[in-house]
Amino acid sequence: MMTGTIETTGNISAKKGGSVILQCHLSSTMAQVTQVNWEQHDHSLLAIRNAELGWHIYPAFKDRVAPGPGLGLTLQSLTMNDTGEYFCTYHTYPDGTYRGRIFLEVLESSVAEHSARFQIP
């Protein structure tokens, strides 16, 4: 039975040209995590972290994706095309797969500064 839950950073925004951390956390289960997959909105793989073999960045993203922190992923040199959904898939046993969703909105620099200024603390 799958008892775990995935907590994510949810809906986030970041500045064009900047970087953003995508984070997922699996809780409420004793299942062993064997691999975490990170996918983009079009289901193309960004990176994986295999429990035994470590991080592997997909070749197309090697210049713009950095592993971590933890099981998260750092997306760098953001463009407007990076706006969209991102998915973390936790491969575990005996539970199976857990999937989390993050929505990233990449904003033009001036808009990002403006929205940040009016965020409620």
Epitope: Q32, T34, I48, L53, W55, H56, G96
Partner: antibody, heavy 121, light 107 residues
Framework: QVQLVQSGTEVKKPGASVKVSCKAS????????ITWVRQAPGQGLEWMGW????????NYAQKLQGRVTMTTDTSTSTAYMELRSLRSDDTAVYYC??????????????WGQGTLVTVSS | DIQMTQSPSSLSASVGDRVTITCRAS??????LAWYQQKPGKVPKVLIY???TLQSGVPSRFSGSGSGTDFTLTISSLQPEDVATYYC?????????FGGGTKVEIK
Amino acid sequence: QVQLVQSGTEVKKPGASVKVSCKASGYTFSSYAITWVRQAPGQGLEWMGWISAYNGNTNYAQKLQGRVTMTTDTSTSTAYMELRSLRSDDTAVYYCARVDFWSGYNYFDYWGQGTLVTVSS
Amino acid sequence: DIQMTQSPSSLSASVGDRVTITCRASQGISNYLAWYQQKPGKVPKVLIYAASTLQSGVPSRFSGSGSGTDFTLTISSLQPEDVATYYCQKSNSAPLTFGGGTKVEIK
């Protein structure tokens, strides 16, 4: 097309070492892992370990720890498996195979043709 | 370590028969299971991964099912070219242990 081509038959004396090579072509070598599997005459398949061609991380079967070393050379897209302190029960066909771990399911999708290693005094 | 046990170790069936091979894991592995076919004198070939996903190019008469500890490989209509030894393998994490194999022959 994906191909894994292994080195030729080896005959070794007990106590010696053997190094088997596996040259990959038809895919981005550094984006996958290579596993090694052996099969003694008339017996089943035995997993020996695997190595990431991306970062060099390895994981070996417990019974072979200390006797086996797996390495890769990304400049030549070649994987190597060295087995030391050979015994007669190491006589087997040794296979390399590519691991598809991007799916999260770690299955072996392409195999080399096998290398027969005979250990005999 | 998780052990993989296959049954039967060998079987003989007629062309056109439905053939079922079972594989049991000593602990739950969800659907992290692959099936391989090895024809006599040949290299192993993956048939199924993720317990039930047919590898590209594999005939549709092969199917896989199961989750947790109990898994099945089915050949819906046995063909002469299916004479081989079939192996299950846990594919969640190391060690990526194989089952002992099931030898399939034609009656």
